[in-house]
């Protein structure tokens, strides 16, 4: 079984996570992908979403955020950058499904953004100086708003939790919606 | 010791399969990706895909799709690449390589240990 | 695919010479390059990822610098070890893609 984990990045202002999910692709190749924060009590709030469906290594802008998702090789590329510090906070990539449940993507990223000067960047840093170019062919989606009949009952782990499951992706059966919020420009 | 320890030379017809092996040790094998890189002789090299050892994920060239398979038995710290329909331009030396990740999520591709690589000809 | 085109794909400098490689990508590839050194019959050793960072162990006469499109590799002072042939890799995009290879000779 594989154990729902999450991973601690710790990064400067500035900086630019740039992470990736890795998906079953026979199952999920085009279909549409969310990224989300979870906030201590609070219910999974979308802050960007790729296209329905899902476009071939083809990027999606949300402010601050690009998507791009690969189908050949099962992976979502997740970049924030310029980080600040209120980005700090838990955050997960899904898919969506429906009418199924979305199904959420291992790992967990638990971002702690700190002020001040990153010193010589680590090796999955740019610098606080980052001037990150956005590819120019962006597209911004909409994303859906999705509704579960579930509730959250406690606020989601703070560190590793031993939630087995059979695969790769988990069904997310105790979300009540999925906040779609707007695009901005 | 930390190393990548990939099966002996393969001599296969045309239209056959290959399978080669890549054995994990001195390091957590379910911890990093494993890719596969193929070289011909005297040429360039060529990455082929990816597989994460702990979930069995995967993604392979577009090129590849449809003949190549990566499969592992974590009970061993074996990682297998399978390729099928072979021709004589699939003669290479094909290796297996770590992506070092300081975080497992991050976008890093950087291959810092590699298999000593399998040199398969292709020969009717 | 992003294409990356390495440059000279062979070169001949004298011990002590200043050796450089460069390797432009067909897009931007943000800083996403490694450089890899390569000797006759071995498998490929990481010497720089992230376009200038040099992996643990590797002598501090390689370095490495770029941004966008266009990248550098540079051995300071070049030795006899250093004889081999240089790739660069780009994981901006996928595919991952290699250049085509650079044969460090000595004169």
């Known amino acids: 079984a594989t154990k729902l984990t999450e991973e601690k990045y710790e990064l400067k202002e500035g900086q630019t996570l740039d992470v990736k999910c890795d998906y079953t692709l026979e199952k999920f190749a085009s279909s549409q992908k969310a990224w989300q924060i979870i906030r201590d009590g609070e219910m999974p709030k979308t802050l960007a979403c790729t296209e329905r469906p899902s476009k071939n290594s083809h990027p999606v802008q949300v402010g601050r955020i690009i998507l791009e998702d690969y189908h050949d090789h099962g992976l979502l590329r997740v970049r924030m950058v310029n980080l600040q510090v209120e980005d700090s906070g838990l955050y997960q990539c899904v898919i969506y499904q429906p009418p199924k449940e979305p199904h959420m993507l291992f790992d967990r990223i638990r971002l702690v953004v700190t002020k001040g000067f990153s010193g010589t960047p680590g090796s999955n840093e740019n610098s606080t100086q980052n001037v990150y170019k956005i590819p120019p062919t962006t597209t911004k989606a909409l994303c859906p708003l999705y509704t579960s009949p579930r509730t959250v009952t406690q606020a989601p782990p703070k560190s590793t939790a031993d939630v087995s499951t059979p695969d790769s992706e988990i069904n997310l059966t105790n979300v009540t919606d999925i906040i779609r919020v707007p695009v901005f420009n | 010791q930390v190393q990548l320890v990939q099966s002996g030379a393969e001599v296969k017809k045309p239209g056959a399969s290959v399978k080669v092996s890549c054995k994990a040790s001195?390091?957590?094998?379910?911890?990093?990706?494993i890719n596969w890189v193929r070289q011909a002789t005297g040429q360039g090299l060529e990455w082929m895909g990816w597989?994460?050892?702990?979930?069995?994920?995967?993604g392979y060239v577009k090129k590849f799709q449809g003949r190549v398979t990566m499969t592992r038995d974590t009970s061993i710290s074996t990682a297998y690449m399978e390729l099928s329909s072979l021709r004589s331009e699939d003669t290479a030396v094909y290796y297996c390589a770590r992506r070092r990740a300081v975080y497992r999520s991050s976008w890093e591709w950087y291959f810092d240990l590699w298999g000593r690589g399998t040199l398969v000809t292709v020969s009717s | 695919d992003t294409q990356m085109t390495q440059s000279p794909s062979s070169l001949s400098a004298s011990v002590g010479d200043r050796v450089t490689i460069t390797c432009q990508a067909s897009q931007d590839i943000f800083n996403d390059l490694n450089w890899y050194q390569q000797k006759p019959g071995k498998a490929p050793k990481l010497l720089i990822y992230h376009a200038s960072n040099l992996e643990t162990g590797v002598p501090s006469r390689f370095s490495g610098s770029g941004s966008g499109t266009d990248y550098t590799f540079t051995i300071s002072s070049l030795q006899p070890e250093d004889i081999a042939t240089y790739y660069c890799?780009?994981?901006?995009?996928?595919?991952?893609?290699f250049g085509g290879g650079t044969k460090v000779e000595i004169k």
């Open positions: 890799q780009q994981y901006g995009n996928l595919p991952l893609t």
């Open positions: 001195g390091y957590t094998f379910t911890s990093y990706d």
């Open positions: 597989m994460n050892p702990n979930r069995g994920n995967t």
